[in-house]
């Protein structure tokens, strides 16, 4: 069957019908419904929401909707023994204690089961000691402290401001520096935009607001007790001492009112420069310890959280494909939230719900997509991407053979300025073409395309007249699909103006103040940005599932491979003498990239010319496109990160949220001048160049004529 035989509507009308069916008012209604109570992973409330979504997706017309459950390691505060931080005097008396909860927002005072701020998976402990302020606790911040300022964090409690990098990386860095505890806080410099009021009068973080979040370093493992395999009924679980990625020192988050009380007493060294100063009225001294009269006072942490194996539930909906039911396009986003989830995740879940409803409406009218569409409502994303990873582990054999694409659908908004897209280069042309067909929701761009407003507000740094599209990193549910399985992936959301708003994420991220009202009053009263995101995400899924030829352009991969090779070569060339001494050459990598470019170009020519009415040839060409992303997977994975297997992209070893290109080579080169055995270090660089060159060449050959 051709795709037209699979439907009673013409292809052009299909997409239009699907997009026209998406309604802002429905997204608004769904968001309201999803945000009235907390939906913390592992709780009864979140199980009930899973069953509600299952029921509604069935009503919307999906062919089947199932719950997939797993028993994974989660973390909760002790309800009778709260976590807090004290300043203690020389007699051990607590002279200051941090707050035990966030003041609830108006209208939510009587809501039960609001989990107090905590760092998920923190071990228990009551360390006490001198404080050291470590800025953002990035790798370079600890380099500054240890190598430049000669400050030893060993045996100290460190206080770090949130932002710039994933909190798990901060904790890992602190552990490596020898710290015995970590305090995380939100500085107004990063979470309070100038000229905006704090919630409930605006979208800024109040002084009592606190960011929750997990502090794991899973590196793609999923459930810490069952790495590589699903946490099912007959799972073999590791002991807690062998669990993957758990922190070894107590960690706790606080707001800026409490942080002020700790930081105002800091002594020791002045901050090294302006980049270490936030916006509080404190000197931002680094320490160690308190100043003058307070020098005998210490900081003490009281952490009593527990790790518990708990049942979680994914909702998996299926819309069977009419022509290629064994080819899967997946739209997934998480359902679990820290508290109300006004933005994260429910602004995304509401969009998925409306996309499912629209597809269901078309299906009820007799239409089917060419390929199968799977819809997923993931659980326990906030606890380490657990729901999506366990499901992918359980279904890995199907996914690696049948997975065409994965589109992520977490928060639809993190601002209301312009579109933000991170995706595989295979999807660049799809995203460009789609956004040219969609209307911009932006003020001043009435009647203009989304592509035009996006390009104007967020121009590509390399190509004029094109918008910026970023590399995929991690910190969301696409991770297992892209980084482990090599399934082409993408994500889209509306974002802030990064030029003028330099705070990290959005101010109320993971706080109790992330409510429906936050979105409805301050971010998107008309829900027009949500609708646009629904059109982008839904439109991508529609095209991926319905195009006769997959909408992937392998030539765009060739372009970025050359850019990434140039970049890693220039990093290496900062050490010209060593490259000479150890005979380090990038010739093999550049040669492989050149071959890839030529083969991709020829493949694209054949793609224009082949007989699309021949189902065997069509399937063959589509399979070459589908399996191209898979060809970048190294079955052995990256050094010490076996579940990050993509050779071209991986989450940065220094920031899980950021993507790094040629990560194997990058990590081998990182801080190479400090390695004790330069010969061994440069040998590893050479090995990583070899792996990268081989992988690019092997991927190129998958695009060659098959015989």
């Amino acid at each position: 069957k051709s795709s037209n035989e699979a439907t009673n509507i013409t292809p052009k009308h299909n997409m239009k019908a699907f997009l026209d069916e998406l309604k802002a008012e429905n997204i608004k209604k769904f968001l309201y419904n999803f945000t009235q109570i907390p939906h913390l992973a592992g709780t009864e409330q979140n199980f009930q929401l899973a069953k509600q979504i299952q029921s509604q997706w069935k009503e919307f017309g999906l062919d089947s909707v199932e719950l997939a459950h797993y028993d994974v390691l989660l973390s909760y505060p002790n309800k009778t023994h709260p976590n807090y931080i004290s300043i203690i005097n020389e007699d051990g008396n607590e002279i200051f204690n941090t707050s035990l909860f966030e003041p609830p927002p108006p209208g939510y005072e009587n809501v039960s089961d609001i989990v107090p701020p905590f760092s998920a998976f923190s071990p228990q402990g009551m360390p006490e000691g001198d404080l050291v302020y470590v800025n953002y606790a990035r790798t370079e911040d600890f380099f500054k402290l240890e190598r430049d300022m000669k400050i030893n964090c060993s045996g100290k409690i460190v206080i770090a401001r949130y932002g710039k990098v994933f909190r798990g990386n901060k904790v890992k860095n602190a552990q490596l520096a020898g710290a015995k505890g970590v305090i995380l806080y939100s500085d107004p410099a990063d979470y309070f935009a100038p000229g905006v009021k704090s919630y409930p009068d605006g979208w800024n973080l109040p002084g009592g607001g606190v960011q929750r979040g997990n502090i794991l370093n899973l590196n793609g493992a999923g459930d810490p007790l069952t790495p590589g395999y699903p946490a099912n009924e007959y799972a073999y679980r590791r002991g807690i001492a062998e669990a993957v990625g758990l922190p070894s020192i107590p960690v706790h988050p606080i707001g800026y009112y409490d942080a002020q009380k700790l930081l105002e007493k800091m002594g020791g060294s002045a901050p090294p420069d302006s980049s270490w100063r936030g916006s509080l009225k404190v000197p931002y001294n680094v320490g160690p310890g308190f100043t003058g009269n307070f020098s005998t006072q210490k900081v003490k942490m009281h952490i009593h959280s527990t790790n518990e194996v708990t049942r979680i539930y994914n909702v998996i909906g299926t819309l069977r494909g009419a022509v290629e039911p064994d080819r899967y396009v997946i739209l997934g986003g998480h359902r679990d939230s820290w508290v109300f989830g006004g933005i994260d995740p429910q602004s995304g879940a509401a969009v998925v719900h409306e996309i499912v409803r629209s597809f269901g409406t078309l299906k009820k009218e007799g239409w089917r997509p060419r390929r199968t569409i799977l819809f997923a409502s993931w659980d326990a994303e906030e606890f380490g991407l657990l729901g999506s990873t366990e499901w992918a582990e359980e279904n890995s054999r199907l996914l690696q053979e049948r997975g065409v694409a994965y589109i992520n659908a977490d928060s639809s908004i993190e601002g209301n300025y312009t579109l933000r897209v991170d995706c595989t280069p295979l999807m660049y042309s799809l995203v460009h073409n789609l956004t040219k067909e969609l209307k911009s929701p932006d003020e001043g761009f009435e009647g203009k395309s989304l592509y035009e407003s996006w390009t104007k507000k967020s121009p590509s740094p390399e190509f004029s007249g094109m918008p910026r599209i970023s590399k995929l990193g991690s910190g969301n549910d696409f991770e297992v699909f892209f980084q482990r399985l090599g399934i082409a992936s993408g994500r889209a959301r509306y974002t802030k103006n990064w030029e003028t708003n330099k705070f990290s994420g959005y101010p109320l991220y993971h706080s109790v103040y992330e409510t429906y009202e936050l979105v409805e009053k301050f971010y998107d009263p008309m829900f027009k940005y949500h609708l646009t995101v629904a059109q982008v995400r839904g439109g991508m899924v529609f095209e991926l599932a319905n195009s006769i030829v997959l909408p992937f352009d392998c030539r765009d991969y060739a372009v970025v491979l050359r850019k990434y090779a140039d970049k890693i070569y220039s990093i290496s060339m900062k050490h010209p003498q060593e490259m000479k001494t150890y005979s380090v050459s990038f010739d093999s990598l550049f040669s492989a990239v050149k071959n890839f470019t030529e083969i991709a170009s020829k493949f694209s020519e054949r793609l224009q010319d082949f007989d699309k009415s021949n189902p065997i040839v069509l399937r063959m060409m589509n399979d070459q496109l589908m399996f191209l992303e898979r060809a970048f997977i190294d079955p052995l994975g990256l050094p010490d990160r076996p579940f990050y297997r993509h050779v071209i992209y991986a989450p940065s070893s220094h920031n899980k949220y950021a993507g790094e290109s040629f990560p194997g080579i990058y990590d081998a080169l990182f801080d190479i001048e400090s390695k004790v055995d330069p010969s061994k270090a440069w040998g590893e660089v050479k090995r990583q160049i070899y792996v990268a060159a081989f992988t690019v060449q092997a991927a190129a050959e998958t695009l060659s004529e098959v015989a």
Partner: antibody, heavy 115, light 107 residues
Framework: EVQLVQSGAEVKKPGASVKVSCKTS????????IHWVRQAPGQSLEWMGN????????TYNQKFQGRVTITVDKSTSTAYMELSSLRSEDTAVYYC????????WGQGTLVTVSS | DIVMTQSPDSLAVSLGERATLSCRAS??????VAWYQQKPDQSPKLLIY???TRHTGVPDRFTGSGSGTDFTLTISSLQAEDVAVYFC?????????FGAGTKVEIK
């Protein structure tokens, strides 16, 4: 071994600007703070400001605020200090120093301000 | 600004004898104090940081001590090559400030 090599002596008229360079080698440039310090003839040391070469973060002595600008060029591992609106009392030897604790010093650059 | 007051202005000590240099901060600076040696027509050199930690390659006859407001640099056995001006400096708060220096000579 760590070396900081500064540009040569300068003679300037009052009201003019001077830009002194400090080329570093023998260490990872982005790792150490660069400070600028001056020493008037027969006098003590006076801190002018510093920069984090990794991200360009600066802190200036308010005494010089608005007159001094410290920059870096990572590609050449070089730091610069520009002092504007020069007056006769700015006559001094200007030093760059690498490391938060002024671990390594340049040889100094004599700037003479005279009409 | 924190004022660093050094005493004495100059000090003459016999070869092999102990030299004790003092530095007082106008307010508590913890242990965020460094000491530098400047020989005639040379750039200063770091001797001590964190009040008492010797910089790499500094002979162990140089010892720093103190915390809060009072700091001392001791040269346990003066050598001819130690003739120089010694500066203390605080890095507890901006602006970073130096003392006026103590000139050490051979008696």
């Amino acid at each position: 071994e760590v070396q900081l090599v500064q540009s040569g002596a300068e003679v300037k008229k009052p009201g003019a600007s001077v830009k002194v360079s400090c080329k570093t080698s023998g260490y990872t440039f982005t790792e150490y703070t660069i400070h600028w310090v001056r020493q008037a003839p027969g006098q003590s040391l006076e801190w002018m400001g510093n920069i984090n070469p990794n991200n360009g973060g600066t802190t200036y002595n308010q005494k010089f605020q608005g007159r001094v600008t410290i920059t870096v060029d990572k590609s050449t591992s070089t730091a610069y200090m520009e002092l504007s609106s020069l007056r006769s009392e700015d006559t001094a030897v200007y030093y760059c120093a690498a490391g938060w604790n002024f671990d390594y010093w340049g040889q100094g650059t004599l700037v003479t301000v005279s009409s | 600004d924190i004022v660093m007051t050094q005493s004495p202005d100059s000090l003459a000590v016999s070869l092999g004898e102990r030299a004790t240099l003092s530095c007082r901060a106008s307010q508590d600076v913890g242990t965020a104090v460094a000491w530098y040696q400047q020989k005639p027509d040379q750039s200063p050199k770091l001797l001590i940081y964190w009040a008492s930690t010797r910089h790499t390659g500094v002979p162990d006859r140089f010892t720093g001590s103190g915390s809060g407001t009072d700091f001392t640099l001791t040269i346990s056995s003066l050598q001819a090559e130690d003739v120089a001006v010694y500066f203390c400096q605080q890095y507890n708060s901006y602006p970073l400030t130096f003392g006026a220096g103590t000139k050490v000579e051979i008696k």
